[in-house]
């Protein structure tokens, strides 16, 4: 059914009216407004921006807009005692020091409160020792070092290049390898696209540019001192020794000019293969230590950052639903930035602002959505998704009963090539149908649909004529809603061409050079890609909040469950003899998936035929759809990760950014041949198959006829 039928107001107020109200010029204006000064979490500037957004959302016409504050653990450099890394000679003299700040971009020389590059939540320390180059510091890189090259990182300072995986995973891997410090750097191979100039003349990373970021391993916990509960006025806080996810060794990020000085002296083993070489004019020797003439020189880190409990502020806006006010569709994105936030997050926040303005305009004309829409400007996302997680912890009982969907709205762009969507399978059909109705902004696709350009540029690896939609991982504010609470979630943004641009993220990510001018000059001068992202995000929210029957298709979940079961079975079948020895069978899982498929098919048939004029039956069917995602939640969580409770999806244990399917089984099987006690290891595989099969079967039964 079209959204026109959702409420008894004039057909004028439909999806088209909402989309037509969205204007690129407004997004541009909002982006400019949000990026003139830094908005670091926990600072006065970010509090002032919160109050500004609260005021403007009220003006736009929302029913209520409140600030929700929490006191969470944040991390800042010491202003009088800067962090740096040095090379010291045998006498302990510092013969080279890394830079203390990034050279400011043109026009920003006099801006105060630019936080220097640092790794948030690094402990203090001044370790010194030999350097070991560990490539991207992925699990497989440490396997290569330790198992194949027999290089021991214990007591060494490791240097790793940014990219491929979340930086927190790099630090965790280094800790497990026994390192006593970590240096993170941006290699031009990953952050300098060929044929493009560095900022301010292009969108590439200059040699003095540095990526900031947190290095936590929270696994969904939120504030490290109050896991599971909101960091409110009467919170009980853990001691720092018991805090969740804090690194135990000093960590610091540098740019590639400074990295060159460290890496050019490296001796020891040659890189194992070309995949360990970046683009600097250095040998990429692994070490340990410096070569010949420099062998007596060491590397010393000087880290003086402090962890501080600090107040943060979310802005929560409400547009009350006319028919089902107790059903919530949430659009949320963060407001805090490392510096100016030209892309991350303000390209997303500007889009949210324009979506709120458009909804407000419709509301002022007498329209209301069928369901309640909640708009959120999250704080402290950069410090571990803290604002969103604390708010969800505080409101978990409401959310688990009333939450229909969560749409994330961080950076609207990470490139300008094509659309990128990650979402629950329940939203596949919604995204397909919506993008078929939207115009493509891409050159060469004038008059064509967004669906068409997206499918052409980013085809599905499985289904011809369809676009790629990826699994949700983490590293953004949807995490608590999807992975912990089981609320159907999705995210959309414009992205780069992954085939031709092999760099990680976008080059200026989390640097001082992420400015308004970066976007306006190089990424999206007409703000047409921002507008398209606003249409996708806003259109999804509109449909989720307004359609009579929730726009979820449970059959798409059935399809992916079969695909994921096939994938995990094929991984297990690399160990045929152990499967036989320990009687490992996937029959229960495949049977559950088969049952799910059949029940989902029957449910979909009933969905076409039921009497939509009967409000009780309508509500019953919608509740079955809403609670399907919830049915994949295991209250006990995943092993050692209690806040990752979704049995079908979790962030990869090796890369927080990536999603893993059947993560419990996957982790039990990972590197199983290296487990000392095979009986125990395969016993855990069997237990995880049991949990997965039970969960899929239980979820299927929620779609059965109720009586």
């Amino acid at each position: 059914k079209s959204s026109n039928e959702a409420t008894n107001i004039t057909p004028k107020h439909n999806m088209k009216a909402f989309l037509d109200e969205l204007k690129a010029e407004n997004i541009k204006k909002f982006l400019y407004n949000f990026t003139q000064i830094p908005h670091l979490a926990g600072t006065e500037q970010n509090f002032q921006l919160a109050k500004q957004i609260q005021s403007q959302w009220k003006e736009f016409g929302l029913d209520s807009v409140e600030l929700a504050h929490y006191d969470v653990l944040l991390s800042y450099p010491n202003k009088t005692h800067p962090n740096y890394i040095s090379i010291i000679n045998e006498d302990g003299n510092e013969i080279f020091n890394t830079s203390l700040f990034e050279p400011p971009p043109p026009g920003y020389e006099n801006v105060s409160d630019i936080v220097p590059p640092f790794s948030a939540f690094s402990p203090q320390g001044m370790p010194e020792g030999d350097l070991v180059y560990v490539n991207y510091a992925r699990t497989e890189d440490f396997f290569k070092l330790e198992r194949d090259m027999k290089i021991n990182c214990s007591g060494k300072i490791v240097i790793a290049r940014y990219g491929k995986v979340f930086r927190g995973n790099k630090v965790k891997n280094a800790q497990l390898a026994g390192a006593k410090g970590v240096i993170l750097y941006s290699d031009p191979a990953d952050y300098f696209a060929p044929g493009v100039k560095s900022y301010p003349d292009g969108w590439n990373l200059p040699g003095g540019g540095v990526q900031r970021g947190n290095i936590l391993n929270l696994n969904g916990a939120g504030d490290p001192l109050t896991p599971g509960y909101p960091a409110n006025e009467y919170a009980y806080r853990r001691g720092i020794a018991e805090a969740v996810g804090l690194p135990s060794i000093p960590v610091h990020p540098i740019g590639y000019y400074d990295a060159q000085k460290l890496l050019e002296k490296m001796g020891g083993s040659a890189p194992p293969d070309s995949s360990w070489r970046g683009s600097l004019k250095v040998p990429y020797n692994v070490g340990p230590g410096f070569t010949g003439n420099f062998s007596t020189q060491k590397v010393k880190m000087h880290i003086h950052s402090t962890n501080e409990v600090t107040r943060i502020y979310n802005v929560i806006g409400t547009l009350r639903g006319a028919v089902e006010p107790d059903r919530y569709v949430i659009l949320g994105g963060h407001r805090d930035s490392w510096v100016f936030g030209g892309i991350d997050p303000q390209s997303g926040a500007a889009v949210v602002h324009e979506i709120v303005r458009s909804f407000g305009t419709l509301k002022k004309e007498g329209w209301r959505p069928r369901r309640t829409i909640l708009f959120a400007s999250w704080d402290a996302e950069e410090f571990g998704l803290l604002g969103s997680t604390e708010w969800a912890e505080e409101n978990s009982r409401l959310l688990q009963e009333r939450g229909v969907a969560y749409i994330n709205a961080d950076s609207s762009i990470e490139g300008n090539y094509t659309l990128r969507v990650d979402c629950t399978p329940l939203m596949y059909s919604l995204v397909h149908n919506l993008t078929k109705e939207l115009k493509s902004p891409d050159e060469g696709f004038e008059g064509k649909s967004l669906y068409e350009s997206w499918t052409k540029k980013s085809p599905s690896p499985e289904f011809s004529g369809m676009p790629r939609i990826s699994k949700l991982g983490s590293g953004n504010d949807f995490e608590v809603f999807f992975q912990r609470l089981g609320i159907a979630s999705g995210r959309a943004r414009y992205t780069k061409n992954w085939e031709t641009n092999k760099f990680s993220g976008y080059p200026l990510y989390h640097s001082v050079y992420e400015t308004y001018e970066l976007v306006e000059k190089f990424y999206d001068p007409m703000f047409k890609y921002h507008l398209t992202v606003a249409q996708v995000r806003g259109g999804m929210v509109f449909e989720l909040a307004n359609s009579i029957v929730l726009p979820f298709d449970c059959r798409d979940y059935a399809v992916v469950l079969r695909k994921y079961a096939d994938k995990i079975y094929s991984i297990s079948m690399k160990h045929p003899q152990e499967m036989k020895t320990y009687s490992v069978s996937f029959d229960s899982l495949f049977s559950a998936v088969k049952n799910f498929t059949e029940i989902a098919s029957k449910f979909s048939e009933r969905l076409q035929d039921f009497d939509k004029s009967n409000p009780i039956v309508l509500r019953m069917m919608n509740d079955q759809l809403m609670f399907l995602e919830r049915a994949f939640i295991d209250p006990l969580g995943l092993p050692d990760r209690p806040f990752y409770r979704h049995v079908i999806y979790a962030p990869s244990s090796h890369n927080k950014y990536a999603g893993e399917s059947f993560p419990g089984i996957y982790d039990a099987l990972f590197d199983i041949e290296s487990k000392v006690d095979p009986s125990k290891a395969w016993g855990e595989v069997k237990r995880q198959i049991y949990v997965a099969a039970f969960t899929v079967q239980a979820a299927a039964e929620t779609l059965s006829e109720v009586a």
């Epitope: 198992r147 214990s154 007591g155 020895t581 041949e673 006690d677």
Partner: antibody, heavy 116, light 107 residues
């Protein structure tokens, strides 16, 4: 269940050669690193050599005491690991055990006696 | 090479006793230490891995502890079948090395 059965031991003169075999069953042999460990009569355990799996390029490692004189190899199609021993010395006399990675499973051993 | 030094080299005990065997590594080996039991004429059997994890089928009277350089194997409520020689071993780095053994004899 995991089984490792060594064979090929015997009496050999100093300077001679011997090839030990270890037939594995009850596990997916090709996935696992394999070791040889020896024990002289009434003495302690001494690690001799290790061979890794194909995913680790069949990398080999040896104890200093045997380096250059022994070669560890494997045939994944036969689920067998070998220890080719050359230039044998009297101090190589021992029971030779085949073990799986981490020495969590051991064979019953095969006796090598080097004597003139 | 990392040297693993076990003590005592032998211990006399009675059924029901508690026996403690220590193993000292010459350098930090993390928790990459295992304990083995060997009876005359048979191959060693793994008891403990990762310094403190009991291998499948090993009775819970066997307990391992320690990290870095100092490790302990404790046998509580000694049983007749426990009289044997016990070895510690490290798999932290090459060459893998073992302690010289501790013989647990009947008093």
């Amino acid at each position: 269940e995991v089984q490792l059965v060594e064979s090929g031991g015997g009496l050999v003169q100093p300077g001679g050669s011997l090839k030990l075999s270890c037939a594995a069953s009850g596990f997916t042999f090709s996935n696992y690193w394999m070791n040889w460990v020896r024990q002289a009569s009434g003495k302690g355990l001494e690690w001799v050599a290790e061979i890794r799996s194909q995913s680790n390029n069949f990398a080999t490692h040896y104890a200093e005491s045997v380096k250059g004189r022994v070669i560890i190899s494997r045939d994944d199609s036969k689920n067998t690991v070998y220890l080719q021993m050359n230039s044998l010395r009297t101090e190589d006399t021992a029971v030779y055990y085949c073990t799986r990675r981490w020495n969590n499973f051991w064979g019953q051993g095969t006796t090598v006696t080097v004597s003139s | 090479n990392i040297v693993m030094t076990q003590s005592p080299s032998s211990v006399s005990a009675s059924v029901g006793d508690r026996v403690t065997i220590t193993c000292k590594a010459s350098e930090n080996v993390g928790t990459y230490v295992s304990w083995y039991q060997q009876k005359p004429g048979t191959a060693p059997k793994m008891l403990i891995y990762g310094a403190s994890n009991r291998f499948t089928g090993v009775p819970d009277r066997f307990t391992g502890s320690g990290s870095a350089t100092d490790f302990i194997l404790t046998i509580n409520n000694l049983q007749p079948e426990d009289f044997a020689t016990y070895y510690c071993g490290q798999s932290y780095t090459f060459p893998y090395t073992f302690g010289q053994g501790t013989k647990v004899e009947i008093k």
